[in-house]
């Protein structure tokens, strides 16, 4: 009779998280008599997974009936596998002894690798808004996947981005891994409707990658452009001056009219019109009573957009010594405007 061999035919098995792992082990002989034990790892720190003789192992079931007299199959199934179960499992035959059984022979081991899906990627943008032509950073994170190999791509409106850095942690062996990527995106005035997408591909996803998105509407600030114009005279001694506030985003905007540097009226943008690109337009007007002024009037439209420093545009209104000629003396003069564009 040849000496007993412990055969673990599968050197390495790959199981998806949540599934059941089958670890095969057979002996080539019934002699010597003694139980089988399964361990994860080798050496003194090894972890007992199953003991044929005693103990309670709720996640482990045997493939065959170990109580049968001539049984030589000691394969086990481990249910509800998680990444923490990864490792090398050894089937070890013990010889009956007194008082304790003695380790007789071990199988070559079966390495259990666990496939775990990455979590849905979470994309986060900068804490503060930025204006067009500025570069902003977006981060993408996904966790809990195994094995370590993973592919991450960035897109802006379907176009793949190339300026990004990605790290997979930890660097060494681990039960599961995390990925962190930072992409740089240059904002343009047309980006209110734009999206940044982080796409993660992993062997567990069977060709159907996970995506996380961020809307640039939460990141971008498009400063308004201002235009002050004087409208035709509405009444003999009244002039209508309008301030066109164009192409701004977000909507939060406060406008102040100044007459010769004194606050005349303050209002908040309410009934705005939306442009195709997602930016807004708004118009405010001021009715100036010319007869109340002896000298020329400097009218200033001052706009505070989204908590930023005010921008303004001024208009000089000529007050004639002869009110009846007012209609012919309405030429406006724009002075020192301070304007910026943001999308």
């Amino acid at each position: 009779e040849e000496e007993l061999q412990v055969i673990q035919p599968d050197k390495s098995v790959l199981v998806a998280a949540g599934e059941t792992a089958t670890l095969r082990c057979t002996a080539t002989s019934l002699i010597p008599v003694g139980p089988i034990q399964w361990f994860r790892g080798a050496g003194p720190g090894r972890e007992l997974i199953y003991n044929q003789k005693e103990g309670h192992f709720p996640r482990v079931t045997t493939v065959s009936d170990l109580t049968k007299r001539n049984n030589m199959d000691f394969s086990i199934r481990i249910g509800n596998i998680t990444p923490a179960d990864a490792g090398t499992y050894y089937c070890v035959k013990f010889r009956k002894g007194s008082p304790d059984d003695v380790e007789f022979k071990s199988g070559a081991g079966t390495e259990l690798s666990v496939r775990a899906k990455p979590s849905a990627p979470v994309v986060s943008g900068p804490a503060a808004r930025a204006t067009p032509q500025h570069t902003v950073s977006f981060t993408c994170e996904s966790h809990g996947f195994s094995p370590r190999d993973i592919t991450l791509k960035w897109f802006k409106n379907g176009n793949e981005l190339s300026d990004f850095q990605t790290n997979v942690d930890p660097v060494g062996e681990s039960v599961s891994y995390s990925i962190h990527s930072t992409a740089k995106v240059v904002l343009t005035r047309e980006d209110v409707h734009s999206q940044v997408i982080c796409e993660v591909a992993h062997v567990t996803l069977q060709g159907d990658p996970l995506r996380g998105t961020a809307n640039l509407s939460e990141t971008i600030r498009v400063p308004p452009t201002l235009e002050v114009t004087q409208q035709p005279v509405r009444a003999e001694n009244q002039v209508n001056v309008t301030c066109q506030v164009r192409k701004f985003y977000p909507q939060r905007l406060q406008l102040t009219w100044l007459e010769n540097g004194n606050v005349s009226r303050t209002e908040t943008a309410s009934t705005v019109t939306e442009n195709k690109d997602g930016t807004y337009n708004w118009m405010s007007w001021l009715l100036v009573n010319v007869s109340a002024h002896r000298d020329d009037v400097k009218l200033t439209c001052q706009v505070e957009h989204d908590g930023q420093p005010a921008v303004s545009k001024s208009h000089d209104l000529k007050v004639s010594a002869h009110p009846k000629e007012q209609g012919s003396n309405t030429a406006a003069e724009n002075t020192g405007s301070n304007e910026r564009n943001i999308y």
């Epitope: 390495s12 057979t26 002989s29 493939v63 065959s64 049984n71 070559a108």
Partner: antibody, heavy 119, light 112 residues
Framework: QVQLQQPRAELVKPGASVMLSCKAS????????IHWVRQGPGQGLEWIGL????????DCSETFKNKATLTVDTSSSTAYMQLSSLASEDSAVYYC????????????WGQGTLVTVSA | DVVMTQTPLTLSVTIGQPASISCKSS???????????LNWLLQRPGQSPKRLIY???KLDSGVPDRFTGSGSGTDFTLKISRVEAEDLGVYYC?????????FGGGTKLEIK
């Protein structure tokens, strides 16, 4: 010495089933895993599955899970593979092979059975 | 499953000349015990496969020493120092590290 005997050929009609046999001798049949391998005409080798004669513990590759059923008869030291719902693309040579201890795997092969599926 | 890729598909060699077959695996075949479970098989025309080499480089008994196996990780090579007429057939690499076992597509050795 270790021997695995297989019938030379089987002719089967489409849609039918066939039971292929692999009779082992020269070793303790119940001690070692038996594997089944397929080779299509002019093709390479493809692993089908394995069975342990002592327990009937079996597993098949995903490709053959609904096609092949592995069984053993320890009294005659014979392993069987039933192939069901046969189609012309199942025409191939089917081999049995024995696993041994430690590194002694795919050493011992049967001669193979040529299965021809034809009306 | 681990994919085994063999090159070339066909090898035409003059008797007495050397031959070399490459086998690449899609994953490392190195197992945790430090061993690499890669075999080379030869299937002569009309016969069942026969194992020539196991554990990358160990020759089975009765296999002539003109056969040598080498490699590690994912890249493996079978070399025949001087091809003889009895060497013709199809050579397969097969891995036993990962479940399920997978074979290379085969390399047909022809005699010129």
């Amino acid at each position: 010495q270790v021997q695995l005997q297989q019938p030379r050929a089987e002719l089967v009609k489409p849609g039918a089933s066939v039971m292929l046999s692999c009779k082992a001798s020269g070793y303790t049949f119940s001690s070692y895993w038996i594997h089944w391998v397929r080779q299509g005409p002019g093709q390479g080798l493809e692993w089908i599955g394995l069975i342990h004669p002592n327990s009937g513990n079996t597993d098949c590759s995903e490709t053959f899970k609904n096609k092949a059923t592995l069984t053993v008869d320890t009294s005659s030291s014979t392993a069987y593979m039933q192939l069901s719902s046969l189609a012309s693309e199942d025409s191939a040579v089917y081999y049995c092979a024995r696993d041994g201890a430690s590194y002694d795997w795919f050493v011992h092969w049967g001669q193979g059975t040529l299965v021809t599926v034809s009306a | 499953d681990v994919v085994m890729t063999q090159t070339p598909l066909t090898l035409s060699v003059t008797i007495g000349q050397p031959a070399s077959i490459s086998c690449k695996s899609s994953q490392s075949l190195l197992y945790t015990n430090g061993k690499t479970y890669l075999n080379w098989l030869l299937q002569r025309p009309g016969q069942s496969p026969k194992r020539l080499i196991y554990l990358v480089s160990k020759l089975d008994s009765g296999v002539p020493d003109r056969f040598t196996g080498s490699g590690s990780g994912t890249d493996f090579t079978l070399k025949i120092s001087r091809v003889e007429a009895e060497d013709l057939g199809v050579y397969y690499c097969v891995q036993g590290t990962h479940f399920p076992r997978t074979f290379g597509g085969g390399t047909k050795l022809e005699i010129k």
